[in-house]
Amino acid sequence: APVPPGEDSKDVAAPHRQPLTSSERIDKQIRYILDGISALRKETCNKSNMCESSKEALAENNLNLPKMAEKDGCFQSGFNEETCLVKIITGLLEFEVYLEYLQNRFESSEEQARAVQMSTKVLIQFLQKKAKNLDAITTPDPTTNASLLTKLQAQNQWLQDMTTHLILRSFKEFLQSSLRALRQM
């Protein structure tokens, strides 16, 4: 991360703002995406009854959505900065195919869906800068992603609605866990 400059010596009428630290920038970016997810979830919940479905019913899906586990080192017990940072970046890279799937799933929130996708790419860049010495980050295979996308888009309407809801819920949970973990770094 860039080193914040020292205090400005000359006295001026308007206060000077220091540049954001790498952590502040990442924090703001995650909150930006979370606010976008909230808008998308609102449209999804208004459109279908997926949001009322029990967690158990929704759990019976074959989506392999990234999820934080104890071994990832992102929880307070057993916290490990390096392991956790790798997990966050890897998880976000894995979510990208699902965010691509969301692009044609919204009517009134089309811009938000695009913004969430784009700002996730930006967040990945911010985090990769923070983790520039970590080489354990694996990028998903483009061919696998392409066939997954085709498969998801071929589902019937009900399954597509459920998939959309699950992606948004999982992504929100993943980002919230990431935000908590990053604040400890």
Epitope: P2, P19, R31, D35, G36
Partner: antibody, heavy 115, light 107 residues
């Protein structure tokens, strides 16, 4: 994808006032925001910025005391109140998300100060 | 205030050319520098931040370099859509300041 939409521009006499609005999508609620202006045929000039809560504002010296930036997060709207306008304030005014650099911009609204 | 000086102020080039635009700060700004592209009647678009980080979906032909006071934006092989005005901006301290712009025209 227009996430930021400015309005309120127009023709105003020197010494007059105008309030610009920037309607933002919900994504901007927790973001620092800036106003940047561009005089016709000229370069970009930062006007000022505001923190997410609206508690901190920063201004360029040439608008300090005349312009006020505020926001209403319940309406997802950013404002620029411009008083004591001068001919040199004639410009297209843009609102932008401010991560120190500006990564999302509105389409701009033209303010003309002339008698 | 930190002054940002861009050169050249205008430049004629052909499709396929390699083009370099420079930006000089009146004092050291570490790598707190961004580059924007602006087309007539449109808002600026972010290309590069932190001196050399390409914003997502910006074509790889655009690259930034430099630190301290001297920075460059390079377009490795000009495409027809690259003819526009380019601005640098420092964010080391407020007031944020921009270069005066470089207008890139077709030769």
């Amino acid at each position: 994808y227009p996430q930021l939409v400015e309005s309120g521009g127009g023709l105003v006499q020197p010494g007059g006032s105008l309030r610009l609005s920037c309607e933002a999508s919900v994504l901007f609620k927790h973001q620092d925001m800036s106003w940047v202006r561009q005089a016709p045929g000229k370069g970009l000039e930062w006007v000022g910025s505001i923190s997410p809560s609206g508690g901190s504002t920063y201004y360029n010296d040439n608008v300090l005391g005349r312009f006020t930036i505020s926001r209403d997060n319940s309406k997802n709207t950013l404002y620029l109140q411009m008083n004591s306008l001068r001919a040199e304030d004639t410009a297209v005014y843009y609102c932008a998300r401010d991560l120190d650099f500006m990564d999302e911009w509105g389409q701009g609204t033209l303010v003309t100060v002339s008698s | 205030d930190i002054q940002m000086t861009q050169s050249p102020s205008s430049l004629s080039a052909s499709v396929g050319d390699r083009v370099t635009i420079t930006c000089r700060a009146s004092q050291g700004i570490s790598n707190y520098l961004a580059w924007y592209q602006q087309k007539p009647g449109k808002a600026p678009k972010l290309l590069i931040y932190d001196g050399d980080d390409r914003y997502p979906e910006v074509p790889s032909r655009f690259s930034g370099s430099g630190s301290g006071t001297d920075f460059t934006l390079t377009i490795s092989s000009l495409q027809p859509e690259d003819f526009a005005t380019y601005y640098c901006q420092q964010y080391y301290s407020t007031p944020y300041t921009f270069g005066q712009g470089t207008k890139l025209e077709i030769k």
